[in-house]
Each structure stands twice: as C-alpha cells, then as structure tokens.
C-alpha cells in the first residue's frame, strides 16, 4: 500500500524540512526561512513560533522542528509547550489579580508559584504541633500526647501571635 501511495502521490516522498510545491510540479522544496515541517509529505511548512517579550528562546527553530520557548526570569511556564508565562511570587505569597500578596494567617506557600494552602491540622490525626507554621512553611506535627513516655511533657508550643495577613481578594 505504501509503495502504491508513493507512486500515486509524489508528495509522500518529500521529507521533513521540505514541502510539496504545487507551483513547481510538486517537487520537494526546502521550507522557507522561519518555517518548518516536522513530518514528510507536507504541502506547506508551518511558521516557526517566535519567542519574544515575556518568552525567551529555549530551542531555535530548525527546518524540521518548531522553536521552543520558556519564560524570562521572574516568570514561569504554564500550559503545554509553555503556552503562557505567569509571574513568580516569593515563598509565603500567592499570585492574585493585584499581584503577589502575602499568605493569610493560617496558610502557607513554600514555592514561587501556586496558592497558599492551610496549615495541617495536627489534632485531626491526634497529634500535637511540634513546630509552628509560617507563611512559608507548614506546621510540623509531633507525636500524640499518648505516645509520650510517662512524665514527659507535651512539646506543643503556644499558639503564635496573630500576624497581619492579606486576604487574596
């Protein structure tokens, strides 16, 4: 079947990096500058992606493969193939419509992206708070009081003073 197809369709012989040029008796012509074809037998070449502005070039376009972009420093990629760039925030913050805002009291974010998440509730697992949470770090849960040897005191520190937090909106 493949051989029959190639006899009937001369375009199927055109390799990646070329296109089947109808204007030139269906001969295989190289893709023009700033275009590519990643598979054989194509009748047109695709325009190369341009990495500009918030995007920067991670891999240059070639005649057989598209350019690949990533984001300029201060931003990170989102979506398939880095289709979007999103602003980084500091740890202890989340991105809102108003830019980066500190995590509310009782929540944390240990990354430069994503949202603030609630501290772990140690008591739900019958445990005590070993280390208090911060805007950047979750609480660390310690052993439950029952796990402590007789005479040992609980390591639960006092509740922290309420710090000012920002509501996301």
């Amino acid at each position: 079947f493949e051989r029959t197809r190639s006899l009937q369709d001369p375009c199927s012989n055109c390799p990646a990096g070329t296109f089947c040029d109808n204007n030139r008796n269906q001969i295989c012509s190289p893709c023009p500058p700033n275009s590519f074809s990643s598979a054989g037998g194509q009748r047109t070449c695709d325009i190369c992606r341009q990495c500009k502005g918030v995007f920067r070039t991670r891999k240059e376009c070639s005649s057989t493969s598209n350019a690949e972009c990533d984001c300029t420093p201060g931003f990170h990629c989102l979506g398939a193939g880095c289709s979007m760039c999103e602003q980084d925030c500091k740890q202890g913050q989340e991105l809102t419509k108003k830019g980066c805002k500190d995590c509310c009291f009782g929540t944390f974010n240990d990354q430069k992206r994503g949202i603030c998440r609630p501290w772990t509730n140690c008591s739900l697992d019958g445990k005590s708070v070993l280390v208090n949470g911060t805007k950047e770090r979750d609480v660390v849960c310690g052993p439950s009081p029952a796990d402590l040897s007789p005479g040992a005191s609980s390591v639960t520190p006092p509740a922290p003073a309420r710090e000012p937090g920002h509501s996301p909106q």
Partner: nanobody
C-alpha cells in the same frame, strides 16, 4: 496572526510624563485581560498593571500605584499606559501582553506579548 505592537517610549526627565500605546490585531481584543510588564536593565521581568475586559477592574504593582494609569479602547483594539511623575527606576523596556480570557485563582498567565518600547528616565 496574533500581534501586539507597542509605541510611545522615549527619553524623559525625572518627574515627566509619557503615554504608551499598544495596538492589538489577530484576536478579539475585548475578550481578554491585558497586561503591562517591564524589564529594567539587568533585571528580571516585572508585572506593572493589568486591566479586565471592559476596563472596570485595574490593578497596579505598588511601586507605580497613583502614578501610572492603565486604560483600554476596545473599539480601536488599543491598550494604554499613562505614566506620570516618572522616576529613574521606571527606566525599562515596557511590553504589553495578552492575559487570559478570564482569571481563575491560580492562572494569571500571559500568552502573547509585543517587542516592547523603551522608556528612559534621566535627570
């Protein structure tokens, strides 16, 4: 082809004003949030301001709040940034960028930006 073209940059003295423009083509401008970002020499990209589809919501980075005003004209597919009381630290390449067609809590990306226009603030 989706395109954004900025203009209006230039050399201005400290305390002066400039108005940047961005003309959009190749997409339905009125369906998207629009964003201004900037890149100062030797620094990373910084978000400056954004505006929602109908111009009713506008947000600014703290350092420009009260000095810069973002606006848009959907009839003419145009985005603007009025910059007053300019400071030396406002010197940067300013880019206009297309945001989402709606914002969800964790998705504040931009998918298209222009080539930029240079603003130089000198004493």
């Amino acid at each position: 082809e989706v395109q954004l073209v900025e203009s209006g940059g230039g050399l201005v003295q400290i305390g002066g004003s400039l108005r940047l423009s961005c003309v959009a083509s190749g997409f339905t401008f009125s369906k998207y949030w629009m964003i201004w970002v900037r890149q100062a020499p030797e620094k990373g990209l910084e978000w400056v301001a954004n505006i929602n589809q109908d111009g009713s919501e506008k947000y600014y980075v703290d350092s420009v709040e009260g000095r810069f005003t973002i606006s848009r004209d959907n009839a003419n597919n145009s985005l603007y940034l009025q910059m007053n009381s300019l400071r030396a630290e406002d010197t940067a390449v300013y880019y206009c960028a297309r945001g989402g067609d709606d914002y969800s809590h964790s998705h504040y990306g931009m998918d298209v930006s222009g080539q930029g226009t240079t603003v130089t603030v000198s004493s």
